[in-house]
């Protein structure tokens, strides 16, 4: 090929929109952290586009991502956590876009886990729990939750609950009785880290009781 | 105008500790790096610590590790260098820098001298 043809290549390359976003995940297995980017227009030919990442890493000057289907990622030990890096869009070593970002404030957590709803009778609640792998992390511990429950008949009517713990509360006497419900959760960074919700747990399903009338109630 | 100003430097017995401090002027000081460097006579300059933005993460050389704590107060816009075992070989000024952007400290203080006699 010529390199009269590479140039134009270029020159094409050049009037694209190659807008990307990114997000990190913090020691994602064991010491290992991640980088994830894609391209903000999804019909971008990515034929022949790179990524690569430099500054604020240890040992190293430049990491290259690997390349997925669409999306572009790097696992490794290597990222400083301190300081700006340069993540780059690149074509034939030249760069065509490039964004400065500290990869502590562009952090994904993992999605919670293990949801699960027990009804208290001699309460009249349900007690909301689930799991985070972030307990166990030394970095992203500090985490804020948003529970959202819907009556599974209301499509889009979630009601939401933020908390920083990993346990909740529904009083009964807020929810229909004798009603299915759908509830789910995800996190995002609080306090020393910055970024981006999580993936939504799996849902968990619970019917509500119907309500018992005391004797000498009347229907 | 001086944007980064050190201070708490001073004669020191080997064994004793000193707190340094660099107050920032520059206004993204609560969301850029800040380090410690420090340069002995006749060396280069050499790093000591470095804190995020935060302060949730940290990286010391080996040569301060366990000895040095590297800390910052971002509503002071502060960044602190505590320091003991303080040794001989820990003479020199010693300079904090500002916003890690690529590998480059965009912005360095005057340095404050810290001497530590046997």
């Known amino acids: 090929e010529s390199g009269y043809a590479q140039n134009g290549d270029l020159e094409d390359a050049e009037l694209d929109d190659y807008s990307f976003s990114c997000y990190s995940q913090l020691e994602v297995n064991g010491s290992q952290h991640s980088l994830t980017c894609a391209f903000e227009d999804p019909d971008v030919n990515t034929t022949n586009l790179e990524f690569e990442i430099c500054g604020a890493l240890v040992e190293v000057k430049c990491l290259s991502f690997r390349k997925l289907q669409e999306i572009y990622f790097i696992e490794t030990k290597k990222f400083l956590l301190i300081g700006k890096s340069n993540i780059c869009v690149k074509v034939g070593g030249k760069s065509l876009t490039c964004k400065k970002i500290d990869l502590t404030t562009i952090v994904k957590p993992e999605a919670p886990f293990d949801l699960s709803v027990i009804y208290r009778e001699g309460a009249n609640d349900f007690v909301v729990t689930f799991n985070t792998s972030h307990l166990q992390k030394k970095y992203v511990k500090v985490l804020m939750h948003d529970v959202a429950y819907r009556q599974e008949k209301d499509e889009n009517k979630w009601m939401h609950v933020n908390l920083s713990s990993t346990k909740l509360t529904l009083l009964q006497r807020n929810l229909q009785p004798e009603a299915m419900y759908e509830i789910k959760v995800r996190s995002i960074p609080d306090h020393y880290f910055k970024g981006f919700w999580s993936e939504w747990s799996p849902s968990y399903y619970f019917r509500t009781p119907e309500i018992n009338n005391s004797p000498g109630e009347m229907d | 105008e001086v944007q980064l100003v050190e201070s708490g430097g001073g004669l020191v017995q080997a064994g004793g500790s000193l707190r340094l401090s660099c107050e920032s002027s520059?206004?993204?000081?609560?969301?850029?790096?800040m380090g410690w460097f420090r340069q002995a006579p006749g060396k280069e300059r050499e790093f000591l610590a470095a804190i995020g933005w935060s302060g949730a993460v940290t990286h010391y050389s080996d040569s301060v590790k366990g000895r040095f704590t590297i800390s910052r107060d971002n509503a002071k816009n502060t960044v602190y260098l505590q320091m003991n075992s303080l040794r001989a070989e820990d003479t020199g000024r010693y300079y904090c820098a500002e916003d890690y952007d690529t590998d480059v400290w965009q912005y360095w203080g005057q340095g404050t001298q810290v001497t530590v006699s046997s």
């Open positions: 520059i206004s993204t000081f609560s969301s850029d790096a």
